[in-house]
C-alpha cells in the first residue's frame, strides 16, 4: 500500500511540476522592469523567453516576439534549450509513469517491468526538474549580472546635461514558478525512484516453496517471511516473490516461470 501511495504521490507531484515548467516556459514575465525608486510607472517592461512586452499605464499591452535565432544571446538560447529538454523529458516520464502505476493494469505486465518503468520515469523526472532549475538559475544569473552592469551605468549623459535612464530588469514571476516547478518535478522523481525499490523483486538465496493441500492453499516462505494463506477463495496459485510485499492488487496477475518450485 505504501508503495502504491508513494508511486501515486510521486506521479501527481511530478505532473504538477511539469505543468509548472510548461507554464514558466510560456510565461512572459521572466524578467520585469525594476521599479527601484518608482513603484508606479507609466511604461512597464517585462520579458520572456519568446517575446518582450510593454504595458502602458493606459492599459495597453504590446508584445513582440523575438523573430531571430542568430541575433539572440547564447545564454537565452541555452535557457530555452534547457526548458524544452525539461518539458520533453518530463512529458515522456509522465507517459512512462502512467503505464508503470501499480493501480493501472496493462495486460500481463510483470511487477519487474513496472518497477523498471517506475525507475525510468523517476530518473526522467529528476533530470527534467534539474533542467528546469538549471535553466531558471542560468537566466537569474544573467539578470543579476546585467542588473549590476546597468546599475554601474545607471545614468549616462552628455556633459551631465541630458540624462538617459537605463532600464534595469529584476526577477520575474516565471523564475519563481520555474524554481518551484523544477523542485516539485525533482521531488516527484525521487518519490518514483523510492517506489521502484518497493516494486522491484528482491533476489534471495532461498526459493519460495508452495505446498498444495486440498481445500485451501498455503504458501510457506522460508527465511522468516510471512506466509500467505488463502482459504477456499484462491483457486489459482499466487505468485510468490521472496521478500516481496504483496497486496490484493496482484491476486489476478499471471504466473511466470519463476513462480513455482
Amino acid at each position: 500500500m505504501a508503495v502504491t501511495a508513494c508511486q501515486g504521490l510521486g506521479f501527481v507531484v511530478s505532473l504538477i511540476g511539469i505543468a509548472g515548467i510548461i507554464a514558466a516556459t510560456c510565461m512572459d514575465q521572466w524578467s520585469t522592469q525594476d521599479l527601484y525608486n518608482n513603484p508606479v510607472t507609466a511604461v512597464f517592461n517585462y520579458q520572456g523567453l519568446w517575446r518582450s512586452c510593454v504595458r502602458e499605464s493606459s492599459g495597453f499591452t504590446e508584445c513582440r516576439g523575438y523573430f531571430t535565432l542568430l541575433g539572440l544571446p547564447a545564454m537565452l538560447q541555452a535557457v530555452r534549450a534547457l526548458m524544452i529538454v525539461g518539458i520533453v523529458l518530463g512529458a515522456i516520464g509522465l507517459l512512462v509513469s502512467i503505464f508503470a502505476l501499480k493501480c493501472i493494469r496493462i495486460g500481463s505486465m510483470e511487477d519487474s517491468a513496472k518497477a523498471n518503468m517506475t525507475l525510468t520515469s523517476g530518473i526522467m523526472f529528476i533530470v527534467s526538474g534539474l533542467c528546469a532549475i538549471a535553466g531558471v538559475s542560468v537566466f537569474a544569473n544573467m539578470l543579476v549580472t546585467n542588473f549590476w552592469m546597468s546599475t554601474a551605468n545607471m545614468y549616462t549623459g552628455m556633459g551631465g546635461m541630458v540624462q538617459t535612464v537605463q532600464t534595469r530588469y529584476t526577477f520575474g514571476a516565471a523564475l519563481f514558478v520555474g524554481w518551484v516547478a523544477g523542485g516539485l518535478t525533482l521531488i516527484g522523481g525521487v518519490m518514483m525512484c523510492i517506489a521502484c525499490r518497493g516494486l522491484a523483486p528482491e533476489e534471495t538465496n532461498y526459493k519460495a516453496v508452495s505446498y498444495h493441500a486440498s481445500g485451501h492453499s498455503v504458501a510457506y516462505k522460508p527465511g522468516g517471511f510471512k506466509a500467505s494463506t488463502g482459504f477456499g477463495s484462491n483457486t489459482k496459485n499466487k505468485k510468490i516473490y521472496d521478500g516481496g510485499a504483496r497486496t490484493e492488487d496482484e491476486v489476478q496477475s499471471y504466473p511466470s516461470k519463476h513462480d513455482y518450485v
Epitope: V40, T41, V43, N45, C53, V54, S58, G59, T167
Partner: antibody, heavy 115, light 113 residues
Framework: EVQLVESGGGLVQPGGSLRLSCAVS?????MNWVRQAPGKGLEWVAW????????TYADDFKGRFTISRDDSKNTLYLQMNSLRAEDTAVYYC???????????WGQGTLVTVSS | DIQMTQSPSSLSASVGDRVTITCKSS????????????LTWYQQKPGKAPKLLIY???TLESGVPSRFSGSGSGTDYTLTISSLQPEDFATYYC?????????FGQGTKVEIK
Amino acid sequence: EVQLVESGGGLVQPGGSLRLSCAVSGYTFSMNWVRQAPGKGLEWVAWINMYTGEPTYADDFKGRFTISRDDSKNTLYLQMNSLRAEDTAVYYCARLARGNGFDYWGQGTLVTVSS
Amino acid sequence: DIQMTQSPSSLSASVGDRVTITCKSSQSLLNSGNQKSYLTWYQQKPGKAPKLLIYWASTLESGVPSRFSGSGSGTDYTLTISSLQPEDFATYYCQNAYSFPFTFGQGTKVEIK
C-alpha cells in the same frame, strides 16, 4: 464612443474644498485629471487605474487632492482640499490611450479660488 | 521629474507654409522595451479642450490630417505641419508620456502672419 462630462466647478474660498465629478461612458481603463490655469499651459494632476483604483499624483497635489472612482455610477472624482488661489484653473478629465496620450477630453469645468 | 522645453514659444506663419515646432526633454523618452519614444503632441484652440495629434513621437492619431507629422528620438523631437491650413492656427503642446508625473511643454502658439 467615449464621452466625458465634468461638473462640480465653481467659486470657492482659499482653504476650502471642492469635489469635481466626471461622468464617464464607454471604455476607460485609466483616467486622469489635467488642469489649465487661465492663459497658461497644461498641467497634469492625477491618474487612476479604473479597475484597481490605484492612483498617482503630481508632487504639487499629493496630500491635497484625491482621485477616486465609483464603478456603480461610472464616475470619476477629484476631491480638492486646502485650495489656494493658484489652483484657479479649468479642470479637464481625460482618458489615457495607446502611447499614454490623452485621446478623449471632457469640456472642462472652471474652478475659481478667491476670497 | 522630466522637464519639457518647447521652442519657439510663438511663431507667425502664412497659409501653405511649412511649420516646425521642436520639443526637448530633460531625459530620454525612448523606451528600451519596444524602442518607442513616449512623446505626444496636442493641438488646442481657444476655449476648447486639447486634441491628440501624435503619440509615440511619430504615430498619427486616427482622424488627424496627414500634413501633421512627428519625428525624433531620445530627447529631441519635432512636430511638422507640411502645409499650414487656416484651421491649424492654434497652440501646440508636447507631453512626456514616458514617466509619471506626465509633464507638458509650455506650448507654441501658431499665429497668422
